[in-house]
């Protein structure tokens, strides 16, 4: 079964500036990648980023940079400043659409004991399933 | 609005071929993949397969595979279904249905679907 | 491929009750379950995604919950226009695949 990972991590040097990496583990090639805050896009989130392989990307305020880590990872930067600007608590979802096998999302906040000054670990954490 | 319209009821005799039309409207074909499924007269649903109508990337059913042949024409926003070798076995409405493109992976608008009837 | 069963073929109701159809999954398909209704016409609708969301202009009277390989589609204040086949439909592998259906009947 597919899974999706998301990662929320605070920038040591914008305290209210946030990057959300999100990537997808399954065999489908995908199709499009949607991120959402405030919970699951079409269930009362909100979309920052909508990222085509082949037709290019698209974001919406506060996102500042949405982009393509690999294949089936993406990144996407949040700007700190202004009335929608994210929060600690803010939840952030991705959606990957992969043929065949479909649809599938999860969802991320920043970690409590998060510690702006640390460095994001080597491997995407948490992973979470896309349930 | 969103519809699918799909075409008319055919017979055909066994060992024929027919080719099915589901034609979309109210969105963008190649923004979501398209689906078909198969339902017998007064039994449940089966799923056939599905396409992505962006690059015409196809999956099937196993049990349909050499039975089915999936493909889409962008310019007039259609989708279709070929049957090949048909049988009394292959005697059943056939519905295309739109992907929602969200979680849970349903199937969120039908055509209203063609009735197929294998008959010498 | 995954065996999804409703073991109720047919159900009878009266206009106003409260009723409740389920579904088992062969296995976990962690809330990807997807319930449809089909009208005596033929005509196919979705109601309900990913267990429990209501798809877009659906009356608040459907509801849907479960998890793990075990999900339920309840009407409230069943009405007239509820008469229909209802079908559950599993989201989780491929190939999809269908219950059986229950067929709703009024008393």
């Known amino acids: 079964t597919p899974e999706v990972w998301v990662q929320v991590r605070m920038e040591a040097t914008e305290l209210s500036s946030f990057t959300i990496r999100c990537g997808f583990l399954g065999s489908g090639s995908i199709s499009l990648v949607t991120v959402s805050w405030g919970g699951p896009n079409g269930a009362g989130g909100t979309t920052l980023a909508v990222l085509h392989p082949e037709r290019g990307i698209r974001q919406w305020a506060p996102a500042r940079q949405a982009r393509w880590e690999t294949q089936s990872s993406i990144s996407l930067i949040l700007e700190g400043s202004g009335a929608s600007s994210p929060c600690a608590n803010t939840t952030f979802c991705c959606k990957f659409a992969s043929f065949p096998e479909g649809s599938w999302e999860a969802c991320g906040s920043l970690p409590p004991s998060s510690d702006p000054g640390l460095s994001a670990p080597p491997t995407p954490a948490p992973i979470l399933r896309a349930d | 609005e969103v519809q699918l319209q799909q075409s008319g009821p055919v017979l055909v005799k066994p060992g024929a071929s027919v080719k099915m039309s589901c034609k979309a409207s109210g969105y963008r074909l190649t923004d979501y993949y398209m689906h078909w499924v198969k339902q017998s007269h007064g039994k449940s649903l089966e799923w056939i397969g599905i396409?992505?109508?962006?690059?015409?990337?196809?999956s099937y059913n196993q049990k349909f595979k050499g039975k089915a042949t999936l493909t889409v024409d962008k310019s007039s926003s259609t989708a279709y279904m070929e049957l090949d070798g048909l049988t009394s076995d292959d005697s059943a409405v056939y519905y295309c249905?739109?992907?929602?493109?969200?979680?849970?992976?349903?199937?969120?608008?039908w055509g209203q679907g063609t009735s197929v009837t294998v008959s010498s | 491929d995954i065996q999804m069963t409703q073991t109720t073929s047919s159900l009878s109701a009266s206009l106003g009750d409260r009723i409740t159809i389920s579904c088992r999954a062969s296995?976990?398909?962690?809330?990807?379950l997807n319930w449809y209704l089909q009208k005596p016409d033929g005509t196919i609708k979705l109601l309900i995604y990913?267990?429990?969301r209501l798809h877009s202009g659906v009356p608040s009277r459907f509801s849907g919950s479960g998890s793990g390989t075990d999900y339920s589609l309840t009407i409230t204040n069943l009405e007239q226009e509820d008469i229909a086949t209802y079908f559950c439909q599993q989201g989780h592998a491929l190939p999809r695949t269908f219950g059986g259906g229950t067929k709703l009947e009024i008393k």
């Open positions: 249905a739109r992907d929602s493109s969200n979680v849970g992976n349903a199937m969120d608008y």
């Open positions: 296995q976990d398909i962690s809330n990807y």
């Open positions: 990913y267990s429990s």
């Open positions: 396409i992505n109508p962006y690059n015409g990337d196809t």
